[in-house]
């Protein structure tokens, strides 16, 4: 009696179970009662990443340099090419099909996480006691200067964008 289901890495065709092609190979002809499945390796710049019965391999992804993309990992017959973005740019999606510029954190904000090829800069507001007076993609919020440790007093309070201004203590004559 012909099978209704096949084992793992097999497929049902013409009432019989044929072996799937291994990753990196495509199907040329199905098996018969007398012959095995015929598979052929994927060509240059092609891949198949699963056990399959595909008659055509997939093209490797093209990392378009005009979009700021470059190859992070070259594809093989079993894996697709992985793209990333040039320095100063990051992917707009997980698939990394285009790139945008890294953002800077405005004054009053510090860098919580530096941008990478796949993620943008993450900024955070400077809390009380900290400041940032520059627009930067790298600088964290800096702590206000401690006037006390310098034997000075606060002459002007700090903000999230400015440091405190220290001055000499008033001496009693």
């Amino acid at each position: 009696e012909p099978p209704t289901a096949c084992r793992e890495k097999q497929y049902l065709i013409n009432s019989q179970c044929c072996s799937l092609c291994q990753p990196g190979q495509k199907l040329v002809s199905d098996c018969t009662e007398f012959t095995e499945t015929e598979c052929l390796p994927c060509g240059e710049s092609e891949f198949l990443d699963t056990w399959n019965r595909e008659t055509h391999c997939h093209q490797h992804k093209y990392c378009d340099p005009n979009l700021g993309l470059r190859v992070q990992q070259k594809g093989t017959s079993e894996t697709d090419t992985i793209c990333t973005c040039e320095e100063g740019w990051h992917c707009t999606s997980e698939a990394c099909e285009s790139c945008v510029l890294h953002r800077s954190c405005s004054p009053g904000f510090g860098v919580k996480q530096i941008a990478t090829g796949v993620s943008d800069t993450i900024c955070e507001p400077c809390p009380v006691g900290f400041f940032s007076n520059v627009s930067s993609a790298f600088e964290k919020c800096h702590p206000w200067t401690s006037c006390e440790t310098k034997d000075l007093v606060v002459q002007q309070a700090g903000t999230n964008k400015t440091d405190v201004v220290c001055g000499p203590q008033d001496r009693l004559r």
Epitope: P65, N66, G68, E86, E87, T92, S98, C99, V100, F138
Partner: antibody, heavy 112, light 112 residues
Framework: QSVEESGGRLVTPGTPLTLTCTVS????????MSWVRQAPGKGLEWIGI?????FTVYANWAKGRFTISKTSTTVDLKMTSLTASDTATYFC?????????WGPGTLVTVSS | DVVMTQTPASVSAAVGGTVTIKCQAS??????LAWYQQKPGQPPKLLIY???DLASGVPSRFKGSGSGTEFTLTINDLECDDAATYYC??????????????FGGGTEVVVK
């Protein structure tokens, strides 16, 4: 795929001017665009860039006086406080770290 | 900002000969460098990107090399049509988060 600049003309010093770059055959939400200028008989000078999400970066010398913005099919360069030294052909160019597609340019002459 | 110093300013060579143009960056830019060809009245045309990659449709007579701060454009088997001005262009993202796009001063190639 093409880009073409327009809006260049003779203006007097101090007059503001906006140049427009019209693109076809590709999406401005995917590609970054730069403005580059070239004074008569001189070399190329990068002005600034706008990315697919409309974020802009400018050359240090251009900050404050030049503004780049865009719509779905055009990229504008707004210039203020123009002087004779701004006389140049202004090019719109596509690309992130280099420029693979350029427009023919539009000539801006600043003279009293 | 990065400054690109291009040499020589002008070079002359015979048809079939070889021309070498050098570009020096004021600091290391890895390999993010492009070369352009510009003819009078035309926009620049991309020849090479990422220091050594040939742009689409550019003959293999054009060869880019170098990394860090020193880059070279070599034109072999010179043709009359190669007479033009050639520019290098760098892209640099600094560890302070600033962007720099800079062109070299240009090299005029005269074909005899």
């Amino acid at each position: 795929q093409s880009v073409e600049e327009s809006g260049g003309r003779l203006v007097t010093p101090g007059t503001p001017l906006t140049l427009t770059c019209t693109v076809s055959g590709f999406s401005l939400s995917t590609y970054a665009m730069s403005w580059v200028r070239q004074a008569p008989g001189k070399g190329l000078e990068w002005i600034g860039i706008i990315d697919g999400s409309s974020f802009t970066v400018y050359a240090n010398w251009a900050k404050g006086r030049f503004t780049i913005s865009k719509t779905s099919t055009t990229v504008d360069l707004k210039m203020t406080s123009l002087t004779a030294s701004d006389t140049a052909t202004y090019f719109c160019a596509r690309g992130a770290t280099f420029f693979g597609l350029w427009g023919p340019g539009t000539l801006v002459t600043v003279s009293s | 900002d990065v400054v690109m110093t291009q040499t020589p300013a002008s070079v002359s060579a015979a048809v079939g000969g070889t021309v070498t143009i050098k570009c020096q960056a004021s600091q290391s830019i890895s390999g993010v460098l492009a070369w352009y060809q510009q003819k009078p009245g035309q926009p620049p045309k991309l020849l090479i990107y990422r220091a050594a990659d040939l742009a689409s449709g550019v003959p293999s007579r054009f060869k880019g090399s170098g990394s860090g701060t020193e880059f070279t454009l070599t034109i072999n088997d010179l043709e009359c049509d190669d007479a033009a001005t050639y520019y290098c262009q760098s892209y640099y993202y600094s560890n302070s988060g600033s962007y720099s796009y800079a062109f070299g001063g240009g090299t005029e190639v005269v074909v005899k």
